[in-house]
Interface confidence: low
Amino acid sequence: TEPLRPELRCNPGQFACRSGTIQCIPLPWQCDGWATCEDESDEANCPEVTGEVRPHHGKEAVDPRQGRARGGDPSHFHAVNVAQPVRFSSFLGKCPTGWHHYEGTASCYRVYLSGENYWDAAQTCQRLNGSLATFSTDQELRFVLAQEWDQPERSFGWKDQRKLWVGYQYVITGRNRSLEGRWEVAFKGSSEVFLPPDPIFASAMSENDNVFCAQLQCFHFPTLRHHDLHSWHAESCYEKSSFLCKRSQTCVDIKDNVVDEGFYFTPKGDDPCLSCTCHGGEPEMCVAALCERPQGCQQYRKDPKECCKFMCLDPDGNSLFDSMASGMR
């Protein structure tokens, strides 16, 4: 990733959005009937159009399944109309591959299926810039319970339900080995308000342990999982179990690299022609690159990873095209 660039201004041939994360869009997209700027300023103060169908632009123009222009004659394409900025909440990844994003806490979650004891699990999450998951609300817990976590054939302890280490510990406060106690957040710095209900205790409890670690048991029958069926277990921290990591959402580039605050990058998603700045774990100040339609090719497919690169699908055409318009940024 490149360092933060100075303030971006729109080039000739681009319309400047008044506000929002998308800064510049191709001029033909102004007043085309499709709001692209987040504040919809590209469709404000437009002359009324009657009796005419406005052309669709960008993503609507190429059917990725067939690699050909839709809507009839390919000559309806204009010089600049292939790449388009996208709405970030729906398209852009805020988590690395394999992590699940929850908007409610701006966090990413991932289950690790290798058998680790609590402390190794905690270290693994820490190395990934996260921690064993704790929950701030019931809704967050329900989100986790509802996820379809990957299920490799040989995962640790996987049957019809799964127990996962999470970031709580149960402290025995009662005397004479009574199991009276309380849940605590395990790791310093967690300020979550949600604490689990009374736990189910491990069957084989070590007489010397005054502290037990939390396992969240998730049931993976689809019919049960969607009813949030789960239970909380207090287990020896040295037993081996799968575990759930949680980390803050982050900017992720198109090659699945995590991007640091303030850096310039192309977001993970389905548009390789966006260039944005990472701010607060989200892409901001985005500019769309301008691509020309590949010449001499009727059927083509966009490269999903490289901007303005196309694969020609014509039987007699050249296989690869680069089509970068001048003054793209």
Epitope: E116, A122, Q126, Q169, F187, K188, S206, E207, S236, Y238
Partner: antibody, heavy 123, light 106 residues
Amino acid sequence: EVQLVQSGGGVVQPGRSLRLSCAASGFTFSSYGMHWVRQAPGKGLEWVAVISYDGSNKYYADSVKGRFTISRDNSKNTLYLQMNSLRAEDTAVYYCAKDLTRSGYPSYYFDYWGQGTLVTVSS
Amino acid sequence: SELTQDPAVSVALGRTVRITCQGDSLRSYYASWYQQKPGQAPVLVIYGKNNRPSGIPDRFSGSSSGNTASLTITGAQAEDEADYYCNSRDSSGNLVFGGGTKLTVL
């Protein structure tokens, strides 16, 4: 650089007391559990005691329970071991050690150790 | 001690050596391993399933099977000559160390 600098060892008579100190630097002392581990001359290692990052939880080996007290002063980045009613079998090099995991309840993995201080209990 | 180690093991320079630690508790718990050179404090080399702290060469690895934990040094170096201690929990949940293995590099 993480450093644990120990002091307070020496020769003491059976039944008497001694206090060991361990001054920490190079990490956020108040975020980690701390341990004492000892090693009798020519012998193996023996875990002695642990204290959680905020001092609220303390655990001891059976061999020292009721005689030794572990404590910490986070404002001074210092760990202590108060040893009372010392016995000949307490003769050992005593090490302070930092717990690997940043938690209220320690992992019992010791990722940094002090240089050790010799305690000799002899009449 | 409830964790049993061979008192001494030797290995030729550059060869692979495995140091073992046995105990019933190792069926449930992982061992961790410490290296101690004469007159020095111990150093954590492997903890848990097979985790190396930063600064520990990748020739050190850990594994576990049944009631036995193993520390393997692949391509032993002269500086690996030391005492090696395993530790884990015992059946009552106490933290215990093995008796130690003296490794000689020939």
